[in-house]
Interface confidence: low
Amino acid sequence: YDFTNCDFEKIKAAYLSTISKDLITYMSGTKSTEFNNTVSCSNRPHCLTEIQSLTFNPTAGCASLAKEMFAMKTKAALAIWCPGYSETQINATQAMKKARKSKVTTNKCLEQVSQLQGLWRRFNRPLLKQQGSSDYKDDDDKHHHHHH
């Protein structure tokens, strides 16, 4: 799916209002410095591509994220604000239903969600090049100032 035509501001609002909090809840008890961010994205559609992949594609050592609250809300946001997204996810949904029902929070999953938090931050803070400025617009957690 090509995320070019999503309503990014609506997705951003969904993230700020609920998804971000669900990610924090999932990571509760984990130090923010515990994992290094190794996954990055260069623009909003690219960020959503990476977010979708990390959220819904099972990986070695972490097969159960799709059932988490933040994942379900992410899926809902993409389905609502990305034209045609729902249709492309029919097969993926069938596969998700076959996934293990038990939620096991492995260290690998925690690392993956830490990467997701970084991707979402990048998605929500595009550079605003106005009058020579290249500072990030800080809409969510103010203490992060990663320049890419």
């Epitope: 559609p45 591509t49 595009p126 550079l127 605003l128």
Partner: antibody
């Protein structure tokens, strides 16, 4: 410095096709989207479509769907717009315009110089 | 498709006067961009994301609005400001308004 250099003017007969190129330089080609916009004489700007050089994904203005094809050659940092089944009302200046997602709202921050396409029998 | 309607189509004013250009969307959009175009030239980005001036645009220009109603304002017209201004949205694909020509009275 970001530059978009388009191919030269074209004169075509009705029913023919035209392929306009847009050579990008001064930035990483696959990091930005490329729009195609046209402007008939004395008329408004009309968005035709957009392509992601990163993955080749496209989205078209329904008005042109089936007639316009957007492609890229990543190795040459060049975007192409092909318009088929030309008619006289396709006479216009065709622009490529880079779309920079670093601005909220994804604005077209750099434009090519324009390619004049004249359709006449 | 979101339709953008600009008004007036032509604005005849003298240098030093205030210019107010309107852009209305057929349904709500997140942001509006504005471009300036002079005869024989490609459009130039003028105002990004409703209210952010593009590099080199003088401070006499400002942008505002939300939802379906957006405005570009020139506080005091200078000779170089006479041109056509287009609004553009991206919330649903991309569309341009019909343009407002600011001409010397």
């Amino acid at each position: 410095e970001v530059q978009l250099v388009q191919s030269g003017a074209e004169v075509k007969k009705p029913g023919a096709s035209v392929k306009v190129s847009c050579k990008a330089s001064g930035y990483t080609f696959t990091d930005d989207y490329m729009n195609w916009v046209r402007q008939a004489p004395g008329q408004r700007l009309e968005w035709m479509g957009i392509i992601s050089p990163y993955n080749g994904g496209t989205s078209y203005n329904q008005k042109f769907k089936g007639r316009v094809t957007l492609t890229v050659d990543k190795s040459a940092s060049t975007a192409y717009m092909e318009l088929s089944s030309l008619r006289s009302e396709d006479t216009a200046v065709y622009y490529c315009a880079r779309e920079d997602y670093d601005y909220d709202g994804y604005a077209m921050d750099h434009w090519g110089q324009g390619t004049t396409v004249t359709v006449s029998s | 498709e979101i339709v953008l309607t600009q008004s007036p189509a032509t604005l005849s004013l003298s240098p030093g006067e205030r210019a107010t250009l309107s852009c209305r969307a057929s349904s709500s959009v997140s942001y509006m961009h504005w471009y300036q175009q002079k005869p024989g030239q490609a459009p130039r980005p003028w105002i990004y994301a409703t209210s952010n001036l593009a590099s080199g645009v003088p401070a006499r220009f400002s942008g505002s609005g939300s939802g379906t109603s957006y405005t570009l304002t020139i506080s005091r017209l200078e000779p170089e400001d006479f041109a056509v201004y287009y609004c553009q949205q991206w919330s649903s694909n991309r569309t341009f308004g019909g343009g407002t020509k600011v001409e010397i009275k």
